[in-house]
Interface confidence: low
C-alpha cells in the first residue's frame, strides 16, 4: 500500500494560504477541543463481560507523549456467574489516531506525522471455528 | 522529515516541550507496516454487543474519512441469539487526533484536533438505580 | 459460504442504462457489505460501487458517481448496479462481491471474500 498523502490538490488554494515548502506542510499542534473529555459509562472496562485493563505508554518525542492502550484481561469472555466462558473470545477493538514525532539528527530536529494503533477496549465475540478436514 | 535547528546550547541541552508550530514531512510515517492487523475482522457482526458503521465524511479534514460505530441494540445477544436486556450495548468512544485545514481550504496547512469517535460497542452489566 | 451470481450484462448503446443483479445464497445475507468491480480487457480489476450490510452507506468511485446506483434487497437477497448514462469505456466484466470484514474502506480487492464469476456489459458508441 502506498504511503498516505495528506495534501490534496483538488481545493482551490486561498490567496491567505501560508507560503509552504515543498514536501511539507505547517501544522499548528495547538489542539482544537483539547478540553473535551470522553463520556463513556461508567467504569465499563471492568464491568464489560470482556473486561480490560489500561497501560500508559510514554514518549518524550511523541506529541501527544501520553497514549492509552487497553488491554483484554481474558481470553474468554465473563459469564453471568461471573465466571470465564472460553467458548466465546474477549478481542481487542482498535483504532489509528495521528501522533507527531520528533527526530534528532546531530543538532537539528525535524517533525514528523506518524499513525499510531491505539487498542480502545475489548468486545466479545463468537470464535471462528475452523473446521479441519 | 523538514530539519529545523535546535536551540543554541546543542548539544548539551535538550528542549522538552514541542514549538507550537512545526513543518512536517507531507507522507505520514506508519512503523506498523501493516495499518492495521485487524483489517479482515468481523467482530462489528459477531460481538454479543454488534454494531453498524456510519461514514462520516469531511474533507476539510485528514483523514477525510471517519467511520462511527453504533450500536445495533439496547441489550446483548445470548447464547440463542436473542436480545437479552439484562445486559447492555455500550459504545467504546476514544479521542483521536485528526488535521484541520486552517484556514481552511488550504491544501498544506493544518492544526491538530481532537475529535470523539465510537469505535466499537461492548455488553456489560447494567448499573441497577434502587429506587428508595 | 456465499455464492454469488450475477446477470443483467448484455450490449447496449452510448448514452444506454442497464441493471446488473447479483443473487447470493448461503450465509445470512444481511451480514455483508457488498461491491461492485469491474475488469476491462488487459486491464487490472478496479473497484466500482459499495453498499454496507444495513444499506444505509454507499460509495462509488469517481468515474461512476452520479451515473450508477448501487442497492440492495435483502428480502431477495440480491444487490443491483443501476447504470445510466453508459460510456463505451464502462465496457467490462462486472463482478459482484462480498466482504467479511467492515473496517471504513470499500475499495480494496483484498478484503473481499466471495466473488461471482461476472456478467459482460459492452457499451457501443
Known amino acids: 500500500r502506498k504511503i498516505p498523502k495528506v495534501g490534496h490538490t483538488f481545493f482551490q488554494k486561498p490567496e491567505s494560504c501560508p507560503p509552504v515548502p515543498g514536501g511539507s506542510m505547517k501544522l499548528d499542534i495547538g489542539i482544537i477541543n483539547e478540553n473535551q473529555r470522553v463520556s463513556m459509562s461508567r467504569n465499563i472496562e471492568s464491568r464489560s463481560t470482556s473486561p480490560w485493563n489500561y497501560t500508559v505508554t510514554w514518549d518524550p518525542n511523541r506529541y501527544p507523549s501520553e497514549v492509552v492502550q487497553a488491554q483484554c484481561r481474558n481470553l474468554g469472555c465473563i459469564n453471568a456467574q461471573g465466571k470465564e466462558d472460553i467458548s466465546m473470545n474477549s478481542v481487542p477493538i482498535q483504532q489509528e489516531t495521528l501522533v507527531v514525532r520528533r527526530k534528532h539528527q546531530g543538532c537539528s530536529v525535524s517533525f514528523q506525522l506518524e499513525k499510531v494503533l491505539v487498542t480502545v477496549g475489548c468486545t466479545c465475540v463468537t470464535p471462528v471455528i475452523h473446521h479441519v478436514q | 522529515g523538514i530539519t529545523i535547528p535546535r536551540n543554541p546550547g546543542c548539544p548539551n541541552s535538550e528542549d522538552k516541550n514541542f514549538p507550537r508550530t512545526v513543518m512536517v514531512n507531507l507522507n505520514i510515517h506508519n512503523r506498523n507496516t501493516n495499518t492495521n492487523p485487524k483489517r479482515s475482522s468481523d467482530y462489528y457482526n459477531r460481538s454479543t454487543s454488534p454494531w453498524n458503521l456510519h461514514r462520516n465524511e469531511d474533507p476539510e479534514r485528514y483523514p477525510s474519512v471517519i467511520w462511527e460505530a453504533k450500536c445495533r441494540h439496547l441489550g446483548c445477544i445470548n447464547a440463542d441469539g436473542n436480545v437479552d436486556y439484562h445486559m447492555n450495548s455500550v459504545p467504546i468512544q476514544q479521542e483521536i487526533l485528526v488535521l484541520r485545514r486552517e484556514p481552511p481550504h488550504c491544501p498544506n496547512s493544518f492544526r491538530l484536533e481532537k475529535i470523539l469517535v465510537s469505535v466499537g460497542c461492548t455488553c456489560v452489566t447494567p448499573i441497577v438505580h434502587h429506587v428508595a | 459460504e456465499v455464492q454469488l451470481v450475477e446477470s443483467g450484462g448484455r450490449l447496449v448503446q452510448a448514452g444506454g442504462s442497464l441493471r446488473l443483479s447479483c443473487a447470493a445464497s448461503?450465509?445470512?445475507?444481511?451480514?455483508?457489505?457488498m461491491g461492485w468491480f469491474r475488469q476491462a480487457p488487459g486491464k487490472e480489476r478496479e473497484f466500482v460501487a459499495a453498499?454496507?450490510?444495513?444499506?444505509?452507506?454507499?460509495a462509488y468511485t469517481d468515474f461512476v458517481r452520479g451515473r450508477f446506483t448501487i442497492s440492495r434487497d435483502d428480502a431477495r437477497n440480491t444487490v443491483y448496479l443501476h447504470m445510466t448514462s453508459l460510456k463505451p469505456e464502462d465496457t467490462a466484466v462486472y463482478y459482484c462481491a462480498a466482504r467479511t470484514s467492515y473496517d471504513g474502506t470499500y475499495d480494496y480487492i483484498d478484503d473481499y471474500s466471495y466473488w461471482g464469476q461476472g456478467t459482460q456489459v459492452t457499451v457501443s458508441s
Open positions: 453498499i454496507s450490510m444495513s444499506g444505509d452507506d454507499t
Open positions: 448461503g450465509r445470512t445475507f444481511t451480514s455483508y457489505p
